[in-house]
Amino acid sequence: MTKEYQDLQHLDNEESDHHQLRKGPPPPQPLLQRLCSGPRLLLLSLGLSLLLLVVVCVIGSQNSQLQEELRGLRETFSNFTASTEAQVKGLSTQGGNVGRKMKSLESQLEKQQKDLSEDHSSLLLHVKQFVSDLRSLSCQMAALQGNGSERTCCPVNWVEHERSCYWFSRSGKAWADADNYCRLEDAHLVVVTSWEEQKFVQHHIGPVNTWMGLHDQNGPWKWVDGTDYETGFKNWRPEQPDDWYGHGLGGGEDCAHFTDDGRWNDDVCQRPYRWVCETELDKASQEPPLL
């Protein structure tokens, strides 16, 4: 409530008090009342009424001005609100679009970063492979140019492990034919000298009967590369070797192979099993430097 309204209310209260004074029984008249009695009172009342009227007029005028201003303000505010709402709406739409664009850009950026990362990894792999192939190629070239007696790197499609190269067949041959194949490749059927090598070979051949470079065709068991059998590593299945004659193929069992669980068994040398070739890398050799 404005100050003017408060003042007006205050005057109304005073007037009602005044009426009550007139209706009541005549009280003792002090000095003030005597001064204010008769025509003076009328004049005073008229003066007050006039003052009150002026005040009311002033206030009314001010009020209508205020109302006008308020209306104007309301209108301005209404326009402002509408305009602001429109702007806010527009901004929120733009904001939504910007947000969507931001999200789209973010996901694009993320994708590009991912693609870039993948490309980088792929490129690194290719570079690594290229370096490896280049090294292998330069080594193969050196081997071709040399007399072939010393090997400084594994041939293509052979697996290097602990300074040896291994080749795993995917077809089957009789033991002697497999042995010949390895020799043609300047290698020999695999000679297993440790539990570690056993595990490596087993991992690559899986649960498949596979010939190794161990036989007793001339009497005692012998490794094809001359490694001593008696003092060396062995991994026979229980009760093996048994030189079994009950297979009906003639003769006993003179050739050793890895069985499905990796342990060794002796079998008829004519059976067409897979095989593993092995060749040692030249002890003194170093990898050729890349030019």
Partner: antibody, heavy 122, light 107 residues
Framework: QVQLVQSGAEVKKPGASVRVSCKAS????????IHWVRQAPGQGLEWMGW????????NSAQRFQGRVTMTRDTSINTAYMELNRLRSDDTAVYYC???????????????WGQGTLVTVSS | DIQMTQSPSSLSASVGDRVAITCRAS??????LAWFQQKPGKAPKSLIY???SLQSGVPSKFSGSGSGTDFTLTISSLQPEDFATYYC?????????FGGGTKVEIK
Amino acid sequence: QVQLVQSGAEVKKPGASVRVSCKASGYTFTGYFIHWVRQAPGQGLEWMGWIKPNSGGTNSAQRFQGRVTMTRDTSINTAYMELNRLRSDDTAVYYCARGGTTVATWGVFDYWGQGTLVTVSS
Amino acid sequence: DIQMTQSPSSLSASVGDRVAITCRASQDIGNCLAWFQQKPGKAPKSLIYSASSLQSGVPSKFSGSGSGTDFTLTISSLQPEDFATYYCQQSDSYPLTFGGGTKVEIK
């Protein structure tokens, strides 16, 4: 043109050794396998073994293992076959033959030497 | 070892005849088969490799066919210089083995 020229005829006593040579010309000696094949009088052909001239790697038929030694000298493009502990049934003409260049063609012969007669007689 | 069986072991034919010699392997050898011609006192001469491929310099009257276990050498028109002994040989497996030979004689 490709030629394989073998050493002359030999007469040996049982228990002795014989060494037959095979000189190659007209091609890259280290690029092809060399095989040794023998033929007893009036009989068929019998394969003895091979040598890989570039590496010196060899293999022989089981019946000759421990008795036959195959070597080569790349400086003079010559392959050698030595047979030990000769018996009378080793009397035969011994041939060298050029094999293929790869593991796939190792046993394919295209050119043969003229043969060397080895007679084992007491 | 793979056994190679040739048939016939000998045959008589006239000049101009078409002659066929067969060779059977004791197991599948694919197309790893060669044919040789040998004349008395001479070294064998290579005619056919890989069952049907002609060695360079060998006349086209010689042809080879077959795969697996059964193979044939055919001489389309026999000439006087073709009278000789013919051998087949497998190169599929160690040890390399030869057929017993087929002697082609003049009738």
